[in-house]
Amino acid sequence: MMTGTIETTGNISAEKGGSIILQCHLSSTTAQVTQVNWEQQDQLLAICNADLGWHISPSFKDRVAPGPGLGLTLQSLTVNDTGEYFCIYHTYPDGTYTGRIFLEVLESSVAEHGARFQIP
């Protein structure tokens, strides 16, 4: 039985040109996390494998950085980065847990202040 829950950063608006950290946290389960995939609109951005470490998709290498932790840092944001991001936790023996974060990238005049900085 899958008892775990995923907590996320929550939906975020951020400034064009800035950077943002997307984070998920799996709780309420003793299952072992074997891999975390980060995806956007059916595109794989990055993988963090418990044994092999991080792999960033080649097409995102310039603008995606691993971490902190199992999170993902998106840099040099453009309005085209607006969309839904998925953290997909592969666990044993539970199976797969998915968290969802919607990011809206805005011109600086309407973005929330502080969105370019790291999560406290």
Epitope: T9, G10, I12, S13, T82, E104, L106
Partner: antibody
């Protein structure tokens, strides 16, 4: 003046599919997210999902994945929602609603499209 | 999904009354940057829903200042200081912090 003009009421048979349109005017269509909302039984509101006109992205309430398909036509400033394999549970009023930048809410709403599923 | 609960379900009022509508969420609506995405709508019969308040306490353009929004975390309130006839209808809160966005069940503001 921002306006969202939706297509007219529909009476459709169970198992059929249909498409609702939402034509935007009075603002730059590609600058704003478009949301879709279902109102059943004259009361409950449910967020179906959204489309992102400037990059073609979508986000769905998982409850409506496989039921609703959201698309946009930038050339005509029109958003569409196709409803698939209709059943009586899909009888409702459907609204399109423009997103407010940076606040994850809706500011302007269409007039609603009534969909009745009946044989 | 985040469950949003509104109370009361029905609120009988007299014109001139001050009223409060409560909205509670099953988890905090504060995102990692301290932003809270909670909005309020009024839905009058035969009309489309209309935005009243967004970001907890920002009044939408054209909304009179007798409307005010407050709250934090999981507990939010919409106050109307002096009820007028045009204020009657169904009030809904909406959380947009977590996917999917979810509405409260509604509060019907009606005349006594």
């Amino acid at each position: 003046e921002v306006q969202l003009q939706q297509s007219g009421p529909e009476l459709v048979k169970p198992g059929a599919s249909m498409k609702i349109s939402c034509k935007a005017s009075g603002y730059s269509f590609t600058d704003y997210i478009m949301n879709w909302v279902k109102q059943s039984h004259g009361k409950n509101l449910e967020w179906i999902g959204l489309s992102i006109p400037y990059n073609g992205g979508t986000s769905y309430n998982q409850k409506f994945e496989g039921k609703a398909t959201l698309t946009v036509d930038k050339s005509s400033s029109t958003a569409y929602m196709e409803l698939l394999s209709l059943t009586s549970e899909d009888s409702a009023v459907y609204y399109c609603a423009r997103g407010i930048k940076g606040y994850f809410a809706m500011d302007y709403w269409g007039q609603g499209t009534s969909v009745t599923v009946s044989s | 999904d985040v469950v949003v609960t509104q109370t009361p379900l029905s609120l009988p009022v007299s014109f001139g009354d001050q009223v409060s509508i409560s909205c509670r969420s099953s988890q905090s609506l504060v995102n990692s940057f301290g932003k809270t995405y909670l909005s309020w709508f009024l839905h009058k019969p035969g009309q489309s829903p209309q935005l009243i308040m967004y970001g907890v306490s920002n009044r939408f353009s054209g909304v009179p200042d007798r409307f005010s929004g407050s709250g934090s975390g999981t507990d939010f309130t919409l106050k109307i200081s002096t009820i007028k006839p045009e204020d009657l209808g169904m009030y809904y809160c909406l959380q947009g912090t977590h996917q999917p966005w979810t509405f409260g069940g509604g509060t019907k503001l009606e005349i006594k």
